[in-house]
């Protein structure tokens, strides 16, 4: 029966399956080069010590080479999200050599067994760039392992046992179960590779995170803070499922990082950025949208290296699906006064107004308690390009902090019926886009007028004196 | 040219075993992996399982796990389908199909395997 | 496990038109879609994969297109070989799963 913990317990359960496999004395590791997108072509299986596979299979030397690497298996064949993956890597990089890392055999196991596997199956794709290093023209520079869940860490050991120093490594969603705090040589690390890029989507804190939650590259990516995706609650992936399994909502998460990754391939005119940001819940009040001093990075294959950073987290919103691009906003609204506001917390409410395209209303999510005669910042984002803003619309309601809360306002009400209505004032917005670095300063269209009740609106346009507060020249980054 | 080859048809009894082979050629049977369908009279197709040759791992629908079981022999290249206690809802077309490499399309088919459960 | 709705149990169409059919999964599939036709006493034929993608003898009159929840087979002139049964099915995750089939006859 399932955990407390809701998904993770189900699926706690699988983990520790055992399962039924006849075994047999064969290579447990092999290398197909995925010569052609056609599914149905069988590719060629590289061999140790065998050049001509490579000399018949047209293996381009000089190219870039990728190692795409599978996890743990139920099912002992490959899931959908592999074609896909070989299919963009082909799109994107015509000449480069593709190869799938099948570990099946092995990867088919209890997953503890799988996990003990890791390391000789690292040590087989390491024997084999070995191997391709003393051919002329090869270069470990040009290779790229990809790996995903459980194959993350198996590219770690591969990165780690290899003569030399591979180009990149790039972590989707590594395995967390058996890896979480392990040493820096007994998971994917940063000294793996010259590069390591990892995107975490399945974390949490409680309950069995399927994917792992610290920070085991370079830069470690966290969309939607690494861990409920979009497009993958219950009602999205159970949907109108007749027997739909809570394995469903887990495999959408944890494979969302592949799903990134190939849009990062295929969508390359529609990058996704991350921006660097000590947690999740300072990114969700829109504090790190900086790209200064190399804070703001393409995320997937367009990552821009930053060996300099270690254990970078970064964080970005996504789309439920591709292309997952949306664009960021950091709002800084100064709330001047309070009016009879009791004990109600106000939730505000914003529409943009931009010169290809309209916002939809967009709350506003309170991290903290909104404070007055402050400023306080959030983060909004859009699904679509709205182009430079000209104005905001903002409203909002009164959300009561509790029963209790409710019923004192309520008598409050009752006592004293003419009570004047409860307002907030706010004179102007702070606009800056993730996107763009531009930072803009929207003023009440009416200054007389910048009190506000709940339901109504207020109107803000573009302040008259300039794109921008003085003290704030800073002039637009350019993006990596 | 690739060629699947199904054993021939089936009369059985209620909760008596069938068991369906499928014989491969013209390709390398431990690069792709085996499926079974089946197609009882008038009805969609329904996916009851596969098997990777190379090593003779195993997923099943949930629906068929206790009942069946699919296994190979690669030194003859063929795949096998037992079902067990049957029953007249069985009765039906059983097909094997080649996946593709990722497993996920069946390009070749097998004739299919007529099994007849009654009493 | 994802149900696969092929709205039309039966479609009429004159030989020489275009014939859509359509296929609707409960939830978002992505490209892991396969059209398949089968004739009586046959057993089925593929005819696209991985929702667009052709294969290799496949007359090109037949086409597909669609991505997540909806999908669509086109044959652009229908030929009197072409009215037969046509399914479709995914592999986005287990079980795999058919459409219940879409019958093309003869208007």
């Known amino acids: 029966s399932p955990t407390p913990f809701g998904p993770e317990g189900q699926l706690a359960d699988e983990l520790h399956k055992p399962k039924a496999i006849q075994t047999e004395v064969k290579p447990s590791v092999r290398f197909n080069l995925r010569t052609s997108k056609d599914p149905e072509h069988e590719g060629c299986y590289l061999s140790l010590g065998h050049s001509q596979p490579l000399e018949d299979c047209g293996f381009n030397m000089t190219a870039k080479t990728f190692f795409i690497i599978h996890g743990w298996t139920m099912s002992g064949i490959f899931e959908n999200w592999l074609h896909k993956l070989v299919s963009a890597l082909h799109t994107r990089e015509k000449d480069a050599n593709v190869v799938v890392v099948d570990w099946l055999p092995l990867a088919h196991q209890l997953y503890t067994d799988a996990v003990n596997n890791t390391r000789v199956v690292g040590h087989s794709i390491a024997r084999m760039l070995d191997w391709l290093q003393e051919k002329d023209d090869f270069s470990l520079g040009n290779v790229h392992l990809i790996g995903y869940s459980l194959g993350a860490h198996v590219a770690g050991y591969a990165g780690n046992f290899v003569k030399g120093t591979v180009g990149r490594i790039t972590g989707l969603d590594p395995a967390g179960p058996m890896f979480e705090g392990a040493d820096i040589h007994k998971r994917l690390s940063p000294d793996d590779a010259d590069f390591v890029d990892v995107l975490h989507t399945y974390t949490r804190s409680f309950g069995l995170s399927i994917g792992i939650q610290m920070p085991v590259g370079h830069i470690d990516i966290y969309p939607n803070g690494g861990d409920f995706q979009p497009g993958c609650g219950l009602n999205d992936v159970l949907g109108s499922m007749a027997y739909g399994t809570i394995t469903e909502v887990v495999k959408c998460e944890h494979e969302r990082a592949v799903h990134l990754f190939v849009d990062s391939l295929v969508n390359q005119d529609k990058p996704s950025f991350a921006f660097q940001c000590t947690d999740s819940n300072r990114f969700k009040k829109g504090i790190c949208l900086s790209c200064r001093k190399n804070r703001c990075n393409s995320i997937g294959y367009n990552a821009k290296k930053m060996r300099n950073k270690r254990n970078s987290k970064m964080y970005l919103k996504t789309r439920a699906g591709m292309p997952f691009r949306v664009y960021h906003y950091q709002m800084k609204i100064h709330v001047f006064s309070y009016k009879n506001m009791g004990e109600i917390e106000p939730t505000f409410y914003v529409t943009l107004y931009g010169t290809n395209a309209d916002s939809q209303t967009l709350p506003l999510e309170i991290v903290e308690r909104i404070e007055q005669n402050a400023t306080n910042t959030f983060l909004v984002y859009t699904e679509e390009d709205l182009g430079d803003l000209l104005k905001i619309q903002l409203t909002w309601e009164g959300a009561s902090q509790s029963w209790y809360n409710l019923w004192k306002e309520l008598r409050s009400y009752l006592s004293q019926p003419h009570n004047p209505g409860r307002e907030l004032n706010i004179r102007r917005i702070r606009v800056k886009s993730g996107e763009t670095q531009r930072k803009l300063t929207f003023c009440a269209e009416d200054p007389e007028n910048t009190s506000i009740s709940p339901g109504r609106e207020l109107w803000f346009r573009k302040c008259r004196d300039g794109w921008r507060m003085k003290n704030e020249t800073s002039p637009t980054v350019e993006l990596p | 040219q690739v060629q699947l080859v199904q054993s021939g048809a089936e009369v059985k009894k209620p909760g008596a075993s069938v068991k369906v082979s499928c014989k491969a050629s013209?390709?390398?049977?431990?690069?792709?992996?085996m499926h079974w369908v089946r197609q009882a009279p008038g009805q969609r197709l329904e996916w009851m399982g596969g098997?990777?040759?190379?090593?003779?791992?195993?997923t099943y629908n949930e629906k068929f796990k206790d009942r069946v079981t699919i296994t190979r022999d690669t030194s003859a290249s063929t795949a096998y389908m037992e079902l067990s206690s049957l029953r007249s809802e069985d009765t039906a077309v059983y097909y094997c199909?080649?996946?593709?490499?990722?497993?996920?399309?069946?390009?070749?088919w097998g004739q299919g395997t007529t099994v007849t459960v009654s009493s | 496990e994802i149900v696969m709705t092929q709205s039309l149990a039966t479609l009429s169409v004159s030989p020489g038109e275009r014939a859509t059919l359509s296929c609707r999964a409960s939830?978002?599939?992505?490209?892991?879609l396969h059209w398949y036709q089968q004739k009586p006493g046959q057993a089925p034929r593929l005819l696209i994969y991985?929702?667009?993608q052709s294969i290799s003898g496949i007359p090109a009159r037949f086409s597909g297109s669609g991505s997540g929840t909806e999908f669509t087979l086109t044959i652009s002139s229908l030929q009197s070989e072409d009215f037969a049964v046509y399914y479709c099915q995914q592999s986005n995750s287990w079980p795999y799963t058919f459409g219940q089939g879409t019958k093309l006859e003869i208007k």
């Open positions: 098997i990777n040759p190379y090593y003779g791992g195993t």
């Open positions: 939830q978002d599939i992505s490209n892991s």
């Open positions: 013209g390709y390398t049977f431990t690069d792709y992996t």
């Open positions: 199909a080649k996946g593709d490499y990722y497993g996920g399309s069946y390009n070749y």
């Open positions: 991985y929702a667009s």
